[in-house]
């Protein structure tokens, strides 16, 4: 199809070699397609629709996003080429940085439903660069925290190190949503819920002599409970003896119960004691079984592949630690009668 | 700060003998167990064999009697002979030490290569 009646808008991605992050693109038709196209079943043409780029009417969440490659060959269908970017409605996630994501990204309805629809399509020209200036060295991260319950802030990555007086218009969404009454590089959280969490969008204009662009970031905001003052639980073996058979082969289990630490470096491993001699058992890795918001509840297995009479004099421990503290319970094997 | 130097490791063929030998410098005490583990390529690490300060030793089923670990305690240094090696003792063998529950220390290895 014709792109030169696409509306054009460009957008910068300046990212950190630091840290992981990630990038969106929203399929931010014109407002009078977008009226006549993605609204059509609820507003009359003269009507003009909130600035949703990526709101929940059927039509809109049916787009196609294609790249227009730099050597001028036909457009190219996101979904077959490119495994790091992920089509979810209207939105394209970048899931990993860099320049070779710079080009030019076209979106358009999926169903062309009258001629008026053809010029319906959005060309975005996305330059990426890697963050150059140590001048500023507190940028905020692309992973924010907030603390359920309390106050809190959610800032603009590209935008953190500058005052609030001098800082550029910003335009905020929220899982994809606009957050109209949000203009400032910093979202000032009263009290911290847990609906709070989400995708975080952040854009500001940034124009030279020759033309303007969308400088944008990507905030993941996850919210979170203060750290455990706790150490952590062992909530099975639960019995200091368990009876065997011997010649059988026989897994021991240890679960335990790990509160939230924002820095979780949880520790747990099976030793053998065995009169005056304590080893580290080799076992397999360790897996999260339930995770919440409050703790994590980790399991580890010793596997015997069979139970032998040495065994029986042996002690097998189970060792968890966290940053507060450990626990230890030991098990004893005992035959069968 | 614990450290723990390994020596010994190198090319051998099928039948042959190795002594491995670890060299314990810093806060390491007499009580501790110390010991061997290895790591073949592409495997878990799994125990060799461990020695406490009086004597008791451990051994993997796999090396029983091929095997024979000792301790100077006095060097602060702990041995593994290697006899009658097959290909499948090739691995990183790693020195370890272990003070108490949570506190264990590791060399970084030295490879055995039985191989004709």
């Known amino acids: 199809f014709n792109i030169s009646g696409c509306s054009t808008k460009k957008l910068l991605w300046t990212y950190s070699t630091r840290s992981e992050e990630e990038f969106v693109l929203f399929c931010d038709l014109p407002e009078p397609q977008k009226s006549h196209f993605c609204h059509r079943n609820r507003l009359s043409p003269k009507q003009v629709p909130e600035h949703l780029p990526f709101m929940g009417s059927n039509d809109l969440s049916d787009v196609q996003w294609y790249q227009q490659p730099s050597n001028g060959d036909p457009l190219e269908d996101i979904r077959k080429s490119y495994p790091h970017i992920i089509q979810d409605k209207c939105t394209l996630h970048f899931l990993t940085p860099g320049v070779n994501n710079s080009g030019s990204y076209i979106c358009r309805p999926k169903m062309i439903k009258s001629p008026y629809d053809v010029a319906c399509c959005v060309k975005m020209i996305l330059e990426v660069k890697p963050q150059t200036n140590a001048s500023c060295e507190y940028s905020a991260s692309h992973k924010q925290d907030l603390l359920l319950g309390s106050t809190g802030s959610i800032s603009c990555p590209s935008l953190s190190c500058q005052s609030d007086a001098q800082s550029p218009a910003v335009t905020w969404y929220k899982n994809g949503k606009l957050l109209s009454v949000e203009r400032s590089n910093r979202i000032v959280v009263d009290e911290v819920y847990d609906y709070h969490q989400g995708t975080y969008v952040c854009d500001y204009t940034q124009s030279d002599t020759v033309s303007s662009w969308t400088v944008r970031a990507v905030v993941q905001v996850r919210t979170i409970v203060g750290d455990t003052k706790l150490k952590p639980d062992i909530l099975d073996p639960v019995e200091d003896t368990l009876e065997v058979e011997l010649g059988k082969p026989l897994t021991i289990s240890c679960k335990a119960r790990f509160g939230f630490e924002r820095v979780f470096n949880p520790v747990i491993k099976w030793y053998i004691k065995d009169s005056d001699l304590e080893w580290e058992v080799s076992v397999p890795e360790a897996k999260s079984i339930k995770s919440t918001l409050k703790d994590e509840i980790i399991e580890r297995n010793i596997i015997l592949e069979k139970v032998t009479q040495r065994d029986l004099r042996r002690k097998f421990v189970c060792f968890v630690q966290n940053s507060i503290g450990n626990t230890t319970q030991s098990v004893q094997l005992k035959e069968k009668r | 700060e614990v450290q723990l130097v390994e020596s010994g490791g190198g090319l051998i063929q099928p039948g042959g003998s190795l002594r491995l030998s670890c060299a314990a410098s810093?806060?390491?005490?007499?009580?501790?167990?110390m010991g061997w583990y290895r790591q073949a390529p592409g495997k878990g690490r799994e125990m060799v064999s461990v020695?406490?300060?009086?004597?008791?030793?451990n051994y993997a089923d796999s090396v029983l009697g091929r095997f024979t670990i000792s301790r100077d305690n006095a060097k602060n240094t702990v041995y593994l002979q290697m006899n009658a090696l097959r290909a499948e003792d090739t691995a990183v063998y790693k020195c370890?030490?272990?003070?108490?529950?949570?506190?264990?220390?590791w060399g970084q290895g030295t490879l055995v290569t039985v191989s004709s």
């Open positions: 020695i406490s300060s009086s004597g008791n030793t």
């Open positions: 810093g806060s390491i005490s007499s009580r501790d167990t």
């Open positions: 370890y030490a272990h003070r108490t529950y949570g506190v264990d220390y």
